[in-house]
Interface confidence: low
């Protein structure tokens, strides 16, 4: 029988009446156009909704937008369009919401063609009030907040000027011209690339990378011959042109660009690209595109300096620059990532790693599923997950995989069971242990979301017909109840819940269509009365993450430590609550060779944990570039994996000697840098 339909599924008592009392409809006095929704702050209940409607006239496009505000998680909305003087807001810039709980919002208005500059509306009180400000430039990008100080904003103008405000957009100053890309770093630092000759496109590969640490009073050129740059964790990366035949290399800095090292990664040609897939303060996952239009490349994982890289995964699916990759960080369990590979026969297969890219394996076949037509052997196959690539290919996949840091171990995704991803209609699968084991959760494609830190999962069937039914589960997707939230079905457009999965409210968005008109409508359902009591100690059970062999003393050890979590029992129907904090007990493991990556000049033969010297390098000096100097490496082949906390056990030693020689290949050496002041 289908999941949730067997007799042992206990029904939540009187849920229809409880939910009916907590279902709030809001019909928006709008013609249907587009709608965008933003949460302002964390746990504030404030939602802003911007509806936009374009009327194409013969000569020009007339636009109209309305702004609505809720302060009760979407149960009620108030039209606050008058606060922005009924101005048409440009949806391509979205609503720029300030970091943390600053309460700041910036909306960018549409202005008439001949105006000197753009116009913004600013609020610093969670959109209760707005101030109109005329800009001395036309913005090209959305206003970007400094992560450290929400009063500091930067924006690029349509004329490629870099503009900065120190008083939350009240006053603006152009600090540099001819700017292609600008990003905030840490400590209110701004990094940006500039062009010297024609344009950003014409100078690609000849750009300069600049830094200002004082909002434009002084500058330092920290790189030349730049193609692009990126920030990830504590790493600053620059893609640097290597020579006249248009290859480029990645350089990395961990001191905001003062010193650079050439990353030990392959160079790429004109048609190839690098992509930072994920980064934290310990390490980075880097994708390096294959030459030719292959649609795949190689994933490399870095050491703690971002310099030495280990090959992590071959034939990694990544279509083109800025294209599609299925790479997904499973945030509900440390060290877990899921992605897709393009196999030799051009089929797409899902791979998972539980140890931050050390080893990749296929996903275990769900026990309650059969292998599909793609499987050669009907008894042996794997689960394959649909993610960004499937969505881009217009497969019947409404949502990417979902996990939440505070819903420990839970991963929800569309998938198919066979030898490769199938183009057939997918089902929804759930894992409650971070991806080690999977169960079919729902037949057919659905939208889904996690509420109350995993206490409730909500789903809506993906259908082209109007819908009026929502499904919910209080036991991590084992059993499902259905609730009819309206008599009049709506054309469903999206599920919205507060980011962070702590809320117990879900908003169902859609539109109604009558003979003459269509209107936006939202239904907000509060599940607080379904989970009527607060969870107590007895509702939680101890769970050892990454456990695969309970008999083994080292069971659960990943990256040098194991973690025991307190997890809600599936049978407990109670509220984790908004203040729920994941309780975990870490314990350090003994070091083994698995806790070390292979150092520069070494590699791991397949199915072997030992790092062996590349045969042709035996007896030769190992030299590599570090901070623009040549280093001599004395090593026995191992370097501790970034973030690995193991102690004792195996302890290979390594030593690096400074050869005090310049690396002529390091295009970002200090002597090529200069400073200047405004």
């Amino acid at each position: 029988s289908a999941p949730g339909e067997d007799e042992e599924c206990g029904r939540v008592r009187d849920f229809v009446a409880k939910l009916a009392n907590n279902t709030h409809q809001h019909v928006f006095d709008d013609l249907r156009g587009s709608v965008s929704l933003s949460w302002v702050g964390d746990s504030t209940g404030v939602i802003l909704v911007l509806t936009t409607f374009h009327v194409p006239l013969v000569i020009m496009t007339f636009g109209q937008s309305k702004l609505y505000r809720s302060e009760d998680y979407g149960k009620n909305f108030k039209d606050i369009t008058d606060l922005i003087n009924n101005t048409f807001i440009r949806t391509e810039f979205g609503m720029a919401i300030g970091p943390e709980n600053s309460g700041k919002v910036v909306l960018t208005a549409e202005v008439s063609g001949g105006s000197r500059g753009g116009r913004i509306f600013r609020s610093s009180d969670f959109a209760k009030n707005f101030v109109q400000t005329d800009l001395p430039f036309h913005p090209l990008t959305q206003m970007m907040y400094s992560p450290q100080n929400s009063d500091y904003l930067l924006a690029l103008s349509t004329e490629n000027g870099l503009w900065v405000s120190k008083n939350f957009g009240g006053k603006w100053e152009e600090i540099h011209k001819a700017v292609c890309l600008a990003k905030w770093g840490s400590d209110n630092t701004i990094f940006f690339t500039t062009y010297a000759n024609g344009s950003c496109k014409a100078d690609l590969g000849a750009l300069e990378l600049w830094r200002t640490s004082d909002l434009g009073k002084s500058f330092k050129t920290i790189g030349v011959k730049i193609y692009s740059f990126g920030l990830g964790g504590r790493f600053l990366f620059a893609s640097v042109m290597a020579d006249k035949d248009t290859t480029r290399r990645i350089h990395v800095s961990t001191d905001q660009g003062d010193t650079w090292s050439m990353a030990q990664l392959p160079s790429v040609g004109q048609e190839q690209f690098y992509s930072i897939l994920a980064a934290n303060d310990d390490m980075v996952f880097m994708h390096v595109d294959e030459p030719g239009d292959t649609g795949f490349g190689t994933i490399f994982t870095s050491d703690d300096r971002g310099i030495v890289y280990s090959k992590s995964l071959d034939r990694h699916l990544y279509t083109t620059t800025g294209g599609e990759t299925d790479f997904t960080n499973v945030t509900s369990l440390r060290g877990v990532y899921i992605t897709s590979v393009l196999s030799e026969d051009n089929s797409i297969q899902t791979m998972i790693t539980f140890d931050q890219g050390g080893r990749w394996t296929h996903l275990r076949k769900p026990e309650n599923s059969e292998c599909d037509a793609t499987a050669k052997n009907k008894n042996e196959c794997s689960l394959h997950i649909h993610a960004s690539y499937s969505i881009s290919q217009k497969l019947n996949v409404p949502m990417a995989p979902l996990s939440e840091p505070n819903a420990v171990g839970i991963v929800i995704a569309h998938g198919s069971v066979g030898d490769a991803i199938s183009v057939m209609v997918p089902d929804v699968y759930i894992s409650d242990d971070g991806g080690y084991s999977w169960t079919k959760m729902l037949e057919g494609p659905h939208y889904y979301t996690i509420l109350d830190s995993g206490g409730i999962i909500v789903a809506i069937e993906h259908s082209s017909r109007p819908i009026n039914v929502i499904k919910f589960s209080t036991d991590e997707g084992q059993c499902w109840q259905t609730y009819t939230f309206t008599r009049d079905p709506i054309y469903f457009t999206g599920l919205a819940s507060e980011p962070g999965a702590r809320s117990m409210n879900i908003s169902i968005w859609g539109f109604t269509e009558s003979f003459l008109t269509s209107q936006w409508v939202s239904y907000t359902i509060d599940f607080k009365d379904i989970l009527e009591r607060n969870c107590e100690e007895k509702d939680y059970t101890i769970w050892l993450a990454h456990s695969t062999d309970p008999e083994d003393y080292e069971d659960g050890c990943i990256l040098g430590y194991k973690e025991q979590f307190l997890r809600l029992r599936k049978s407990s129907v109670c509220q984790n609550g908004r203040d729920y904090v994941v309780t975990k007990q870490p314990s350090i493991c003994l070091c083994s060779l698995e806790d070390f990556l292979c150092d520069f000049g070494y590699y791991r033969p397949e199915n072997d944990s030992k790092c062996v010297e590349q045969p042709e390098l035996k007896g030769h000096d190992l030299e590599f570039c570090l901070y623009g100097r040549e280093e001599h490496l004395t090593t026995n082949g191992y370097r501790k994996i970034p973030g690995d906390k193991c102690q004792g056990g195996v302890n290979p030693v390594r030593e690096v000697k400074d050869l005090k020689k310049k690396c002529t290949s390091n295009f970002l050496s200090p002597e090529k840098q200069n400073s200047k002041s405004n």
Partner: antibody, heavy 129, light 107 residues
């Protein structure tokens, strides 16, 4: 344009040494490795070794270990291949070739191989008593 | 070391015909394989890299395929300038090794 220009033909006696140069132009010398390949008369191609112009680190085929030395001069964008203890079977055309191999080449390659895309014109070395 | 074996040693083909050259590796070289063309008295010229990607300026009649241990170079319609010796070369594990070559001659 990208070019590798090699030194002229050499005639050597058995037991002597020969040093062949290869001057690179048209690209950033330090951005690519350089391989040396030889071809005996009427025979196929034989890879001898590779040098990283950055640090000068080298990797040689086992067959030539102890007899071959590859060096580079970054100021003149030139690589050198010296073969000692010459024997008659070392009579061959010696080529330098730009090689975009992996980081610590040639180990397990970390991507599809680009191939040796630019070759010198070849230097004929004749070993005869 | 990885041994590369090319077959046939000689291939006699008429102009305009299709030529198929094989290269086998003694162990998997993944896609780390290149094909070269060499004419008498000239240096080799790169045709194909990454097993299947044509190098810059190489006509579309040349195509490479294969992965792992079996590789093929196909010349769809031989032109007079295509009669030469063709070598495959692996770069999966050092030392780099070449196949013995296939001579394509006029029939």
């Amino acid at each position: 344009q990208v070019q590798l220009v090699q030194s002229g033909a050499e005639v050597k006696k058995p037991g002597a040494s020969v040093k062949v140069s290869c001057k690179a132009s048209g690209y950033t010398f330090t951005s690519r490795y350089m391989s040396w390949v030889r071809q005996a008369p009427g025979q196929g191609l034989e890879w001898m070794g590779i040098i990283n112009p950055v640090g000068g680190s080298t990797s040689y085929a086992q067959k030539f270990q102890g007899r071959v030395t590859m060096t580079r001069d970054t100021s003149t964008s030139t690589v050198y291949m010296e073969l000692s203890s010459l024997r008659s079977e070392d009579t061959a055309v010696y080529y330098c070739a730009r090689d975009p191999s992996g980081i610590a080449a040639p180990g397990p390659a970390s991507r599809g191989y680009y191939g040796m895309d630019v070759w010198g014109q070849g230097t004929t070395v004749t070993v005869s008593s | 070391e990885i041994v590369m074996t090319q077959s046939p040693a000689t291939l006699s083909v008429s102009p305009g015909e299709r030529a198929t050259l094989s290269c086998r590796a003694s162990q998997s070289v993944s896609s780390n394989l290149a094909w070269y063309q060499q004419k008498p008295g000239q240096a080799p010229r790169l045709l194909i890299y990454g097993a299947s990607t044509r190098a810059t300026g190489i006509p579309a009649r040349f195509s490479g395929s294969g992965s792992g241990t079996e590789f093929t170079l196909t010349i769809s319609s031989l032109q007079s300038e295509d009669f030469a010796v063709y070598y495959c070369q692996q770069a999966r594990l050092g030392p780099w090794t070449f196949g013995g070559g296939t001579k394509v001659e006029i029939k």
